[in-house]
């Protein structure tokens, strides 16, 4: 059997409600009889864009071999939430689970996957599926990192000085300039975990007439340019 880490695939599709949906699930064809011998615990770091739907999967153990399926959800500043399903007696148990956006994909006796619809910034955390079988307990964990696309603005505020801002991104965006100038970068951290990055650059060299701000972020990159005018110019704004 392939090593679990090698066989994880990120799939993205469009749903009817126009929200992207992503999953790190195994294709059923990859489930092998000796998979349980390979799998002790798999932990995956998974960046997911805010406002998309996410599906988190359990280890690929045949449902007929299952006794209990448990999802443990540890979110920042909250008590650990557990959702457990006992197959034999068809019982579900939930403890400290208050977020209605985090649910079983369907009936847990048919599908052990967990879904987040839609992903919010508060869903940053650790998610672990524990499958109890006669051969032992098998785990798959996800360090879910919620990504927030920053809003990018570029404007001139003084003679030959431009300001590029990547507002409320998660994680913090990186700002670079072409050509390089005399720059100062500040980061402002917000209580919801987002970061605003502000880069202010000055160009003494008078032959520099156009400057480009390049914003790099896990959700995508964006470049804006501005002409350096003797007086402050028009404000440019864009979403990544």
């Amino acid at each position: 059997a392939a090593q679990p880490n090698n066989s994880l695939m990120l799939q993205t599709s469009k749903e009817n409600h126009a929200l992207a949906s992503s999953s790190l699930c195994m294709d059923e064809k990859q489930i092998t009889q000796n998979y349980s011998k390979v799998l002790a615990e798999v932990n995956t770091s998974w960046p997911v864009k805010m406002a998309t739907n996410a599906v988190l999967c359990c280890p690929p153990i045949a449902l007929r071999n299952l006794i209990i399926i448990t999802w443990e959800i540890i979110l920042r500043g909250q008590p650990s939430c557990t959702k457990a399903y006992r197959k034999e007696t068809n019982e579900t148990k939930e403890t400290n689970c208050t977020d209605e956006r985090i649910t079983w994909v369907s009936r847990p006796d048919q599908n052990s996957d967990l879904q987040i619809r839609p992903v919010a910034i508060t869903h940053d955390g650790y998610y672990r599926c524990i499958m109890v079988t006669p051969d032992g307990n098998f785990h798959r964990g996800y360090h879910l990192q919620v990504l927030v696309t920053p809003e990018v603005t570029l404007f001139q505020n003084r003679n030959r000085t431009a300001v590029c801002k990547a507002v409320a991104g998660k994680p913090a965006a990186q700002i670079s300039w072409i050509p390089e100038g005399d720059c100062a970068t500040k980061q402002e951290y917000w209580s919801n975990g987002t970061v605003t990055v502000k880069s202010t650059c000055h160009w003494e060299v008078h032959n520099v007439s156009t400057v480009t701000c390049h914003v790099s972020h896990l959700t995508g990159n964006k470049s804006l340019y501005i002409e350096l005018l003797p007086v402050p110019g028009a404000k440019k704004s864009a979403k990544l």
Epitope: I67, I68, T70, E72, T82, A84, E88, T89, K93, E94, T95, N96, I130, V132, P134, N137
Partner: antibody
Framework: EVQLQQSGTVLVRPGASVKLSCTAS????????MHWVKQRPEQGLEWIGR????????KYAPKFQDRATITADTSSNTAYLQLSSLTSEDTAVYYC?????????????WGQGTTLTVSS | QIVLTQSPALTSASPGEKVTMTCSAS?????MYWFQQKPRSSPKPWIY???KLASGVPARFSGSGSGTSYSLTISSMEAEDAATYYC?????????FGAGTKLELK
């Protein structure tokens, strides 16, 4: 250390009601299932029922459905068994036992038992 | 409800002797659980999921079976094994116990 501490010996009259307690330490009962089991003198074990303290969902054996009530108080980490309309047939030792809620598959910890005697 | 029938009800064994007791279910169950109880003590978990030994249970104990027929075996009887053993099913509510097998030391 996980422990289940049950109330002491109880003597009651026929027809009366009784409420037995089981106080847990070393774990939070809200995370688990709490069961009650009856054992009459020199006899076997009989399952009475269980509670999920997280939502107060209960299940009972048909035999005990009408006269047994299982409750839980998560603030005091205590499970209770109330028995009504007592007869001499209810004279027994009553055990509380837990099943760990996340991955537990069996009764892993038991209380020391409460001896209930119904006699006039 | 599922009825569990244990046999024998009473048995005795000498130290070193092999002991087998059975538990028969009135309908098929997925797993069997066993508990040991000594006089004036609470039951102790002994075997779970048919064949897994609970914490602290000596390796001379084993469990096996499937469907409606299950058994607990002691490969070599020791004095401390004298007790009553109960089987229990969790395949459907109500949960049920067998009437017990009392094992005495010869």
């Amino acid at each position: 250390e996980v422990q289940l501490q049950q109330s002491g010996t109880v003597l009651v009259r026929p027809g009366a009601s009784v409420k037995l307690s089981c106080t847990a330490s070393g774990f939070n009962i809200k995370d688990d299932y709490m069961h009650w089991v009856k054992q009459r003198p020199e006899q076997g074990l009989e399952w009475i029922g269980r509670i999920d303290p997280a939502n107060d969902n209960t299940k009972y054996a048909p035999k005990f459905q009408d006269r047994a009530t299982i409750t839980a108080d998560t603030s005091s980490n205590t499970a209770y068994l109330q028995l009504s309309s007592l007869t001499s047939e209810d004279t027994a030792v009553y055990y509380c036992t837990r099943v760990e809620g996340r991955t537990g598959t069996y009764f892993d910890y038991w209380g020391q038992g409460t001896t209930l005697t119904v006699s006039s | 409800q599922i009825v569990l029938t244990q046999s024998p009800a009473l048995t005795s064994a000498s130290p070193g002797e092999k002991v087998t007791m059975t538990c028969s279910a009135s309908s098929s169950v997925s797993y069997m659980y066993w508990f040991q109880q000594k006089p004036r003590s609470s039951p102790k978990p002994w075997i779970y999921l048919t064949s897994k030994l609970a914490s602290g249970v000596p390796a001379r104990f084993s469990g096996s079976g499937s469907g409606t027929s299950y058994s607990l075996t002691i490969s070599s009887m020791e004095a401390e094994d004298a007790a009553t053993y109960y089987c229990q099913q969790w395949s459907s509510y109500p949960l049920t116990f067998g009437a017990g097998t009392k094992l005495e030391l010869k």
